[in-house]
């Protein structure tokens, strides 16, 4: 094997150059340092076959498989993948090694498999085998970001321990309330892990990857704002970091801020202060209280005091395990056809929940809004007045919660009829559930007033279609009514509907539909 060339195989992961959500740009801006894939001679193979270490790639990532050949003279080559071939253009690097690359853009499962590179040099022929697979998405995680103080700097680092590595961004807003909604012009986004500008009104950090987006808000007490009617409450699990920011603005610098836990000053090393002048020359001070890893005894009332402002407190509760508190009893609603109505669930939860609304096996996005009293609310209004069973499902890392709702729409019955050789049946989904009458139409009763009571079998709510009750009535055929027209009528407090059927007709034969209010 003296003549065999020296082969080096490397993997280059392309850095994503675009910051938009779900975007995997198709070309490399900056490359991570190449990863050596070994490329050992494969034993017991016919011909000379080098095998590179297996490569695992995230869905939609872009990579380059590269071979460096230290062999004299020119080389020619061909890539083969799944019976398709691709010409390759070898070039030479500064060390005069032949370089052959296969760039795979926006990786998909279809592009996973064995890539064979056939190389012909003046001295010998050989094959290089790369096996590329998609990283198992079951191993993907997306964890809520948390904050750390940057060493020796007045800055916060946002960390999310997620796979694949998430894109981290700070979401900043200097307005109050509604205008700090995600898409508001008042919102500024900074795609970086470190934040130095910590004086803003509303500061959140968000992390996003394949699995979605998770955000954490920097808990803030603003001494210039009127305190909430209920004491703000912050939940944390044992071991999580605690960060509370106290913010105050005053006409001059002659004021100071302090933190106390249950009337005891925080120890040094558990707080740090920053100050700046605002545009109108007023002084803004912020004082952070932080604990890198909370224990049960960090529970209590944290009070921020100022020499020039009324003090304000927050209750910090440390729990062993996450929770979702809400009433899970099922609720039934009855509304008119054009009445505006929303389902709503009020809950208290930590960590923040992920939730869905489900109707007829279809899931709908779930929005949640924080209330001032520490509770959150999720509303669902997109029912389009469809009666049935609606399900609210919420979960976080530690708890699950499901609540059922039934929606009934008040409306007059609508009748569908079908007939077979032995019986006629009518169905209605009006609400309240209708009652039934059957009438026979004959020479004696051209207006179909002769009531039929024999052989009638009513089934109220015989089948539940996605929670929607259906009522039916069946008339068994007798000689007395064979060949006649019969009429089934369904009625409730909102009106009556009828359907006329010719008995003894082949197959379903709804004849005339009468709508009688």
């Amino acid at each position: 094997n003296q003549d065999l060339p020296v082969i080096k195989c490397v993997l280059i992961n392309h850095k994503n150059n675009d910051s938009s959500v779900g975007k995997s740009s198709s070309y490399p801006m900056v490359s991570e340092s190449p990863e050596d894939l070994g490329c050992a001679l494969r034993p017991q193979s016919s011909g000379t076959v080098y095998e590179a270490a297996a490569v695992e790639v995230d869905v939609s990532a872009s990579i380059t498989l590269q071979v460096l050949v230290d062999a004299p003279g020119n080389i020619s080559c061909l890539w083969v993948f799944k019976h398709s071939s691709l010409n390759c253009q070898p070039h030479f690097d500064l060390q005069n090694r032949g370089v052959v690359s296969m760039v795979i853009l926006k990786m998909t499962e279809t592009q996973a498999g064995e890539y064979l590179l056939f190389i012909q040099s003046e001295a010998t022929n050989y094959t290089i085998l790369f096996t590329v697979s998609i990283r198992n998405t079951l191993l993907y995680t997306l964890r809520r970001p948390y904050f750390r103080k940057m060493e020796n700097q007045d800055a916060l680092v946002c960390i999310s321990e997620s796979v694949p590595e998430p894109i981290v961004e700070w979401v900043l807003c200097d307005s109050q309330g509604e205008s700090c909604k995600e898409e508001s012009p008042a919102v500024v986004k900074k795609e970086e892990k470190v934040l130095h500008e910590l004086f803003g009104t509303d500061i959140r950090c968000c992390a996003r990857n394949e699995l979605g987006r998770e955000c954490t808000r920097l808990f803030t007490i603003d001494l210039n704002q009127t305190p909430q009617t209920t004491l703000p409450q912050l939940f944390l699990k044992v071991g999580e970091p605690l960060w509370i920011r106290c913010k105050a603005v005053h006409v001059n610098h002659g004021f100071g801020l302090t933190w106390e836990l249950e009337n005891k000053a925080l120890e040094e090393g558990n707080y740090f202060e920053m100050s700046t002048y605002s545009t109108n020359r007023t002084m803004i001070r912020i004082l952070f209280a932080f604990v890198s890893s909370v224990a049960r005894n960090d529970t209590g009332y944290y009070t921020c005091s100022s020499s020039k402002h009324p003090s304000q407190s927050a209750l910090v509760t440390i729990v062993e395990k996450g929770f979702i508190n809400a009433t899970n009893s099922s609720e039934d609603y009855e509304i008119d056809q054009y009445e505006e109505f929303c389902f709503s669930v009020r809950f208290k939860a930590y960590p923040q929940i992920r939730c869905t609304w489900t109707f007829s096996r279809k899931s709908f996005p779930c929005e949640q809004k924080g209330l001032d009293n520490g509770y959150s609310i999720s509303k669902f209004c997109n029912h389009k007045h469809q009666p049935g069973e609606y399900i609210f499902h919420a979960e976080n890392d530690d708890a699950q919660f499901t609540k059922m709702f039934t929606l009934n729409i008040r409306r007059k019955p609508q009748v569908l009829a079908e007939a077979s050789a032995s019986q006629a049946s009518c169905f209605s989904d009006g609400y309240p559930l209708p009652s039934w009458t059957w009438k026979k139409c004959s020479d004696k009763s051209p207006n179909c007033t002769e009531e039929i009571t024999e052989g009638v079998w009513n089934r109220k709510a015989n089948r539940k279609v996605f929670g929607q009750w259906v009522s039916s009535s069946t008339l068994n055929m007798s000689e007395a009514i064979k060949g006649f027209l019969v009429k089934c009528c369904a009625y409730n407090s909102l009106g009556t509907s009828c359907e006329t059927i010719l008995l003894n007709s082949p197959g379903p034969f709804p004849f005339i539909q009468d709508n009688i209010s």
């Epitope: 280059i12 675009d18 779900g22 975007k23 995997s24 740009s25 198709s26 070309y27 490399p28 869905v59 939609s60 380059t64 590269q66 993948f81 799944k82 398709s84 691709l86 010409n87 390759c88 253009q89 070898p90 070039h91 370089v99 052959v100 690359s101 296969m102 760039v103 795979i104 853009l105 926006k106 998909t108 499962e109 279809t110 592009q111 998405t137 394949e210």
Partner: antibody, heavy 119, light 111 residues
């Protein structure tokens, strides 16, 4: 064999939205990008964007952000593009296409869906 | 965005002769020596049809009369010899950088 079958021509009013479907047969869309291309007479071909149905991941041409959104239903092997707030500029033939194994070059195309926006 | 400029805009060639269409990119469409330039043929009322992928690879089922060459910013599609069935508009397309872009097209006619 691989085929992409698009929904029929649409005549729409300005301001309305339209949803075009692209049903694939002969392969599974979940692990292949589906590209969407616009063609207007005299304007050549324009890439609108793409979706990878299995992951729901989508990439948009900045020019069409807010105009086009992509969805897919892997159970019916169908991809969709929705065009919103239609204007006469959106009158065009829209194609779906599948990139080949080596990426970027589109080897299978739908027959195209003509969208006409007129009041 | 990468702008692709095709020339000529239209081309008339005699049957059996060579047709050459050029496509110039406003920046390189190569990544590690891989050229992400592709060529399509489109006839009226039909979708485009892939002829050449990654600069020089002939799509399966396409006659060998079609060939592609070039790298970085300059690419060429050659049809030799031209047949009557080749009357169509030809487009180049790059996929090296989002957004993918197409050339303005070259209309091929028979002299």
């Amino acid at each position: 064999q691989v085929q992409l079958q698009q929904s029929g021509a649409e005549l729409m009013k300005p301001g309305a939205s339209v949803k075009i479907s692209c049903k694939a047969t002969g392969y599974t869309i979940s692990s292949n990008w589906i590209e969407w291309i616009k063609q207007r007479p005299g304007h050549g071909l324009e890439w609108i964007g793409e979706i990878l149905p299995g992951s729901g991941r989508a990439n948009n041409n900045e020019k069409f952000k807010g105009k086009a959104s992509f969805t897919a239903d892997t159970s019916s092997n169908t991809a969709y593009i929705q065009l919103s707030s239609l204007t006469s500029e959106d009158s065009a033939v829209y194609y779906c296409a599948r990139p080949n194994l080596f990426g970027g070059a589109m080897d299978y195309w739908g027959q195209g869906t003509s969208v006409t926006v007129s009041s | 965005d990468i702008v692709l400029t095709q020339s000529p805009a239209s081309l008339a060639v005699s049957l059996g002769q060579r047709a050459t269409i050029s496509c110039r990119a406003s920046e390189s469409v190569d990544t590690y020596g891989n050229s992400f330039m592709h060529w399509y043929q489109q006839k009226p009322g039909q979708p485009p049809k892939l002829l050449i992928y990654r600069a020089s690879n002939l799509e399966s089922g396409i006659p060998a009369r079609f060939s592609g060459s070039g790298s970085r910013t300059d690419f060429t599609l050659t049809i030799n010899p031209v047949e009557a069935d080749d009357v169509a508009t030809y487009y180049c397309q790059q996929s090296n950088k989002d957004p993918w872009t197409f050339g303005g097209g070259t209309k091929l006619e028979i002299k």
